[in-house]
Structures are given as C-alpha cells and as structure tokens.
Interface confidence: low
C-alpha cells in the first residue's frame, strides 16, 4: 500500500503527532519555583482542556466534492497550484487532481498529484479521499492499531486478567485497558505523564464533544484538585514530585535524582498511578499517552534520567574507548521507542543537514521528496523522511545508525543534543554491562 | 525558443581530460536541473549526471563516479561536464538534458522528478590512442 | 542500482497495428517511469513522464501504463513517423537508469 491512512495528512495539515507536542511545550527546564499545589493543578487542567479541544479539532466538515475551478499562474518560476491542484508540463496551467483517485494537500508546483490511499481489508473508511486530503482509515469495530504494529489493525481482548479490572473500552487507537483492582496500576505497566499535553490525531478521529464530556471534564478537575491538596500535605509528595517532574522532561533541573535501579514498585508508585489514572480522562486514547514507566530491570543496571545526565560528562577519551548502549527505558522496542521521539529532531538537528542525513541513512532522492510533499509543513519535514527511514529500513533503523550517521557527516553538536535528548526525555537510557561486555 | 547546444566534443587520448559545455536560452536557467546522458556508437541511452538547480546536490552513475565532475555557472547559463581519466568506454555521444520539473523559489518544496524534456543535439566525444 | 528490462528488443509492424512495449525494473519504482522516442541521429524526445503523463504535442495514441515493477508503451496506430526507437528510464533513484530500448521497424 502507498502511504498508511493513520499518517496522511488532514485537512488541516495537521500530521499525526506520537505524544506530546512541539518541544517548545515540554522539554524547557523549570523556571522559578512555584507552590506545588499548583504545579499539578495546572497540570491537570492543561491535560483536560488539550483533551478536549482534541475531541473539538477532530470534527471533520463535510467532505469537499470538488476543488477550485483550474487556475492560471503568470509565470513558471513562481508558479504555484492550490491544494487540490498539480501544475501543468509547461508550468502554465493548474490542473485538478482527479477526485478519489488523486490529492494535494498544500500549494505546489507537483507535476503530479500524490496517490489516495487505498485502506486495507480490516479497516473501514472514515473519510474518503478528496482532490485536497487523502483517505483517512481507521481499525474496524474489535480491533485497533497501536504504535507498535502500526502497519496492522490488531484485534482487541475480550477480557481482562484475574485480578484486574477494565476500565477502558476496545477503541480503534486502543485495546481494552485493565487496572489492577487494588492499586489501579495498569497491566501495560504504562504511567501517563501530566506534564505532556495531549494533541489530536488525524487518522484517528476522537468521538464527538458532548454535554457528558465537559460535564466529566468539571467533575475530573475538581477530583484532581482535592487530590492535590492531599499530596501537597502528605508526606509522600516528596516521592512523587520527582516522578512528575522527571518522567516527562527528564527531571532537567531537578535537585532531587531518583535512583530507578535500586527502586521497587510499590507504595510510592501505585500513589503515583492513582493520581494519574485520575488525571486521565477516558475518553483521550490509552496510546496518546505515551512515556512509560520503566520496567524492573533484568540482568542490567537501567540509569535513572539524572543518572545519565552525570554519564555525559566524563572526557572524550572515555566516549571513545567505550561506546555506551543506548536501550529503551522501558524495555520496549528499540525502533518503535526512537520513533515517538522523532518529532522533536527537527529542533536538534541544523535544516541543512536534514538531506544529508536521510541520504546517508539510505533514504533514495524521491523517497526524500515524497517525504517532503507528504509533510504537513516545513518542520514536518524530517519527521516525515525519518518515519520513512523505519518504514524502509525495519529492525535495522537503530539509534546508533542514526548517530553514526550525524558523526560521520560531522554534526557532532546534534548527536550530543539527541543523545542527551533521548536520556533526558527518560524514553533511553546507558545499558551498563560488565566493563566491554555490552559495549559494542 | 528552449534550446540546449552542448560543445567541446572532440579526439582524446585515454587518461586525458576534456571539458564539455552546454549553452541554455529560451527558459530560466536557474529554474531547472540538468542531465549530461551519453550513447556509445550503436549502443541505447547511459545517465552520466545530474545537477540540482542552484548546483546544491549533484549525482554520478557509477561508471564516471570519481572521474567526471558536472557544474553550472548560472549567470551564464551554462552547463559543464568535467572529464579526466578518459577510457576508451567513454567514447559516446555525449547530451545535455533540461530536467522536466521547475523550480519555484516561491514554494516551500523542490520535486525533483527526473524526466527529461528538452536535449542538446549532443556533441562527440571519442577516446581512443 | 535499479536495472531496466524492455522487451522486445526490436519488433517489425504495419502503419496502424497496435504496438506495445514493456518494460520491467528489478524494484518497485511507483509511477515513476518515462518513456522516450530517438530516431537515427537525432536526440531523444520525452513522450511519456510518471507512467502515463503525455508530454504536451505528443499524440494521442501513445499511452503509457503500470506501477511497481511493470510498465507499459502502447502506440494504438501506428503511423509512418513512429518508426524508431523506445526507451523507458526509471526516475526513482539516482543512479537513473534506461532500458536497453525497443526498435520499432517496418514490416
């Protein structure tokens, strides 16, 4: 199939964003110091109105049949077609895309539209494709994609393990999602972040805003407050604040370093996992919130974000000796845990460097321009070719590969923000092994 | 009209360089990206290079990689083809060709589609000792 | 590198027979495939671009045809002008490629 139904973008040329959104948002470090009380509050409240204006900005108007009538350009040399249009051979004339065959989402110079998306068996049509946005698919009833299988619609459990209870529906973004029944932690182990903001998702259209909604909204914000209040005055906020702090953001500027390795779930953390699951409204979909909570370790020393902040500053002789591991915080998988944090790149790695890299990671001339007239906007850009780097290169798209590439071609200072990146988001840390045993 | 004269064709000795032009009129230049293509007597068409509008990002087929060097002087709208280490394989007539899509400095983007669309009328080169 | 297969290499036909020429890539190359026309001792011409893209001037009875792997040049007259010689050339990637190209002689 040509390009997947969930990443097309829609008509607002808005692409799906995994998590949270731009890194302007949320990977500052903290600024003057503020009551705690209020930290979470507003928190809370930001968590709540994103949700909701998600469910708002989902809404799609009636699909448009047509676009505008052909339109002339003066000249070729700024000859550019509206959305629904490509240019002609001779650069005089736009012509219309063909409707349900053919799409152009911006204004271009494509000699060309781009090819609708045919949605594959199992899935259902929630938009047809139109001269200006491609088709939008979506997981039929009893099924659902997640970020990792991305490719496929997954069917659904029928029911949660003993012992566990449900407390969220089969969705087409989501599995049945099941809380233990004493502590609320969920099975996936996953522990949404308050500080992320949530954003809408294209290829995945949230149910309609309602009276109950809002009404749920209300009732949630004024639950979180009193819960705020409580853990403001018990002593565990101490235990909390710098999972809060530091999930997310990487707990940059945070005195307070948590030790990962050495702590247990328990207590503390089903604390933690009442607070947030209280945070979380249900109707925003389970994989939207995406950093997880790391797993207890097996056989190897996990660094907690401070940690691995520390590991950075040892002398370059060292880093060249030895070359660290990065693995996911989580356990999960490798490719799919670099993936959600490809949107943030953009910012770390210099424009002029974004070809280069994706031609050095194997990327072909019109793969890079298919990216590119993909994208929903300039920043998009290596997003975009990036998420086509997995498509193509699977398992073998690593975050070595994509480091050793910025080294080679001598973009030393982006390796170092996105290796520090990837530590202090929490989503990677340094696998530490028997002195070289692990070292590649 | 749109025409493409290429020029400095010519006898050469393997292992000796030559330098090849191509002159454009009738179209903006520095719009458009632009192939040299050879055919060797008898023999269908070979790709040698390609070099983007503003000359930002140039590609080889790998028979000349390393060997031929493809550059534009866009204010004299001028295409050139650099050729050392001449072989007798290189023997070919050798074309300029305009890349079919324009380039807009008004959109965000370059589509870059690689059909060609109007030719030289090609100039000789032949190596031989 | 992507390597172009055309076939046939040269066939021999009458002014309004239906021709077709097809050519084959080791890859899937999308829709981006051109088709050109060279008579002796001239330059090529660009017929055909991203498959089935009729270059303005050329007429109507060439049509070009396929996606991934397998393309199609059908002449559905053929008139005395179109004797001559037909290439395909892949735009997916650099190196770009031509097939080895197809004679197309009076019978």
């Known amino acids: 199939m040509e390009q997947r139904g969930q990443n097309a973008p829609a008509a607002s040329g808005a692409r799906k964003r995994h998590g949270p959104g731009p890194r302007e948002a949320r990977g500052a470090r903290p600024g003057p110091r503020v009551p705690k009380t209020l930290v979470l509050v507003v928190a809370a409240v930001l968590l709540l109105v994103s949700a909701e204006s998600a469910l708002i900005t989902q809404q799609d108007l009636a699909p448009q049949q047509r676009a505008a009538p052909q339109q002339k350009r003066s000249s070729p040399s700024e000859g550019l077609c509206p959305p629904g249009h490509h240019i002609s051979e001779d650069g005089r004339d736009c012509i219309s895309c063909k409707y349900g065959q053919d799409y152009s989402t911006h204004w271009n110079d494509l000699l060309f539209c781009l090819r609708c998306t045919r949605c594959d068996s199992g899935e259902v049509e929630l938009s047809p494709c139109t001269t200006t946005r491609n088709t939008v698919c979506q997981c039929e009833e009893g099924t659902f994609r997640e970020e990792d299988s991305p490719e496929m619609c997954r069917k659904c459990r029928t029911g949660c393990p003993r012992g566990m209870v449900k407390v969220g529906d089969c969705t087409p973004w989501s599995d049945i999602e099941c809380v233990h029944k004493e502590s609320g932690t969920k099975h996936s182990g996953e522990v949404p972040a308050v500080e992320e903001t949530v954003t809408s998702s294209p290829g995945t259209p949230a149910s309609p805003c309602s009276l109950s909604g809002i009404i749920i909204g209300v009732t949630v914000a004024a639950v979180v407050l009193i819960v705020a209040v409580f853990v403001c005055k018990s002593l565990l906020w101490k235990k909390v604040l710098p999972y809060l702090k530091g999930i997310c953001s990487g707990g940059g500027g945070d005195p307070e370093r948590v030790d990962r390795s050495s702590q247990r779930p328990g207590a503390e953390d089903n604390v933690l996992n009442e607070i947030v699951s209280i945070l979380q409204p249900t109707q925003v979909p389970e994989q939207e919130m995406e950093v997880q909570e790391p797993a207890e370790p097996t056989g190897v020393n996990m660094l907690s974000p401070g940690e691995s902040e520390h590991l950075l500053e040892p002398a370059e002789a060292e880093r060249s000796q030895r070359r660290r591991l990065l693995v996911p915080a989580n356990e999960g998988d490798p490719t799919e845990t670099l993936r959600q944090c490809f949107d943030d790149f953009a910012d770390l790695v210099p424009f002029d460097s974004w070809e280069p890299l994706m031609r050095k990671l194997g990327l072909m001339d019109n793969e890079i321009k298919v990216a590119k007239a993909e994208a929903a906007g300039h920043r998009d850009t290596l997003y975009t070719m990036l998420i086509k780097w997995v498509n193509k290169t699977g398992r073998d798209a690593s975050v070595h590969t994509l480091l050793d590439a910025l080294e080679t071609l001598g973009e030393r200072l982006a390796k170092q923000k996105i290796e520090d990146h990837l530590l202090s988001s929490g989503k990677f840390m340094y696998l530490e092994g028997n002195a070289d045993s692990a070292m590649s | 009209q749109v025409q493409l004269v290429e020029s400095g064709g010519g006898v050469v000795q393997p292992g000796r360089s030559l330098r090849l032009s191509c002159a454009a009129s009738g179209f903006t230049f520095n719009n458009y990206g632009m192939h040299w293509v050879r055919q060797a007597p008898g023999k269908g068409l070979e790709w040698v290079a390609v070099?983007?509008?503003?000359?930002?990002?140039?590609y080889y087929a790998d028979s000349v990689k390393g060997r031929f060097t493809i550059s534009r002087d866009n204010s004299k709208n001028t295409l050139y083809l650099q050729m050392n280490s001449l072989r007798a394989e290189d023997t070919a007539v050798y074309y300029c060709?305009?890349?079919?899509?324009?380039?807009?400095?008004?959109?965000?983007?370059?589509?870059?589609?690689?059909?060609?669309?109007?030719w030289g009328q090609g100039t000789t080169v032949t190596v031989s000792s | 590198d992507i390597q172009m297969t055309q076939s046939p290499s040269s066939l021999s036909a009458s002014v309004g027979d239906r021709v077709t020429i097809t050519c084959r890539t080791s890859q899937s190359i999308s829709t981006y495939l051109n088709w050109y026309q060279q008579k002796p001792g001239k330059a090529p011409k660009l017929l055909i671009s991203?498959?089935?893209s009729l270059q303005s001037g050329v007429p109507s009875r060439f049509s070009g045809s396929g996606s991934g792997t397998d393309f199609t040049l059908t002449i559905s007259s053929l008139q005395p002008e179109d004797f001559a010689t037909y290439y395909c050339?892949?735009?997916?990637?650099?190196?770009?490629?031509f097939g080895g190209g197809t004679k197309v002689e009076i019978k």
């Open positions: 070099i983007w509008y503003d000359g930002s990002n140039k």
């Open positions: 060709a305009r890349d079919r899509t324009v380039y807009s400095n008004s959109s965000p983007f370059y589509y870059y589609y690689y059909g060609m669309d109007v």
């Open positions: 991203a498959t089935s």
């Open positions: 050339q892949q735009s997916y990637s650099t190196p770009l490629t």
